[in-house]
């Protein structure tokens, strides 16, 4: 229950992807405001976009404080113009999200490759670390520095005049494969998660192809 | 609980076609890769074929590269696999199969299997 | 396309026996090698992944060892429903290959 002229928000959904995290609700706000609050499990609320008629609030910079932690948000209503007033209980309407765990949810932002190189029949492709706005010691962390093992590439290749993909893996930025002398190929790489149960998966990077200006070929 | 569950093989004559189905429940084909792989009478194991459905990738052993199509309906949690061109050698039981898609584990769950006989 | 060359093709073995399978690959594969049972009739069933890895659920009888490009499937003490076909596989590369099989039987 609450007050007639404030309806409670609805669709609380957690967008997020290497971590950078958006709450996101419903309706759009008709002579209402809304504020958000986060917290972990076991810890106390804040309070965040204050009185605000958007119906997105960006809560990166509480979640990236400890991405293993589980965080629970919820969305206040209050009538604009009038936010000290109350619901008929005594309290603001608010509703809560679904319980959010950044580590295991995150979506992987789409790959990029940064370079490749042929030398003779060996091609080593490298993947871009993306940095994510994880932070330790005052420095923005990695992909890699977040996930550790955890995070592994899938890497496909084929050859231009060829359509099946064959598949490298590796948990490092790295994947170093063998290719028939001659032939072009294209590549696309995936990140995945395998231990998750879902969002394993990233889009695919941008396909990549050899004569292109990203690669470098050496003939030995 | 993971399962994988093929259907739609039996008897075609040489020449002819068949599409078998693998139908998943316990998760979501999308988030991880399906591969086929057929075990004649009485003999070894043979790796067919992949897809990773959410990108619809393929990659088809030689002996059935442009007679077999893999493909997949996310919507269903459906792989399938289109047979053209069939051969007797071909008769095989045909094995759907979850690829776990970690450096270490591989084909972690399979399906019971679906006989496909090409026989005149 | 690497190949798996499994030995011995059958073996005759009793209950409580040591039983050790090897297969070969003709390249380099890492340790990404797998081993699978399989029983008349059913599906394979995996036992040992990346070489070396008792999979879950799998009896700690079963193991699984590399050196080099040869992987070697043991069971320690063999027991009555031990008695199947066994299969190695690389999935280093694309496409991934399996060894021709171990048939054990009783002896």
């Known amino acids: 229950s609450g007050t007639t002229n404030t309806v409670a928000a609805y669709n609380l959904t957690w967008k997020s992807t290497n971590f950078k995290t958006i709450l996101e609700w419903e309706p759009k706000p008709v002579n209402q405001v809304y504020t958000v609050q986060i917290s972990t499990k076991s810890g106390d609320w804040k309070s965040k976009c204050f009185y605000t008629t958007d119906t997105e609030c960006d809560l990166t910079d509480e979640i990236v404080k400890d991405v293993k932690q589980t965080y629970l948000a919820r969305v206040f209503s209050y009538p604009a113009g009038n936010v000290e007033s109350t619901g008929s209980a005594g309290e603001p309407l608010y509703e809560n999200s679904p319980e959010f765990t950044p580590y295991l949810e995150t979506n992987l932002g789409q790959p990029t490759i940064q370079s490749f190189e042929q030398v003779g029949t060996k091609v080593n492709v490298t993947v871009e670390d993306e940095r994510t706005l994880v932070r330790r010691n005052n420095t923005f962390l990695s992909l890699r520095d977040v996930f550790g093992k955890d995070l592994i590439y899938t890497l496909y290749y084929w050859k231009s005049s060829s359509s099946g993909k064959k598949t490298a893996k590796t948990n490092t930025n790295e994947f170093l494969i063998d290719v028939d002398k001659g032939e072009n190929y294209c590549f696309s790489v995936q990140a995945v998660i395998p231990s998750r149960t879902v969002n394993r998966k990233s889009t695919d990077s941008p396909v990549e192809c050899m004569g292109q200006e990203k690669g470098e070929f050496r003939e030995i | 609980e993971v399962q994988l569950v093929e259907s739609g093989g039996g008897l075609v004559q040489p020449g002819g076609s068949l599409r078998l189905s693998c139908a998943a429940s316990?998760?979501?084909?999308?988030?991880?890769?399906i591969h086929w792989v057929r075990q004649a009478p009485g003999k070894g194991l043979e790796w067919v074929g992949y897809i990773d459905p959410y990108n619809g990738y393929t990659y088809y052993a030689d002996s059935v590269k442009g007679r077999f199509t893999i493909s997949a309906d996310t919507s269903k949690n459906t792989a399938y696999l289109q047979m053209n061109s069939l051969r007797a050698e071909d008769t095989a039981v045909y094995y759907c199969a979850r690829d776990y898609g970690s450096l270490q584990v591989f084909i972690d769950h399979w399906g019971q299997g679906t006989l496909v006989t090409v026989s005149s | 396309d690497i190949q798996m060359t499994q030995s011995p093709s059958s073996l005759s073995a009793s209950v409580g026996d040591r039983v050790t399978i090897t297969c070969r690959a003709s390249?380099?594969?890492?340790?990404?090698v797998a081993w699978y049972q399989q029983k008349p009739g059913k599906a394979p069933k995996l036992l040992i992944y990346s070489a070396s890895f008792l999979y879950s659920g799998v009896p700690s009888r079963f193991s699984g060892s590399r050196s080099g490009t040869d992987f070697t499937l043991t069971i320690s003490s063999l027991q009555p429903e031990d008695f199947a076909t066994y299969y190695c596989?690389?999935?280093?590369?694309?496409?991934?290959?399996f060894g021709q099989g171990t048939k054990v039987e009783i002896k």
């Open positions: 316990g998760f979501t084909i999308s988030d991880y890769w």
């Open positions: 390249q380099d594969v890492n340790t990404a």
């Open positions: 596989q690389q999935h280093y590369t694309t496409p991934p290959t």
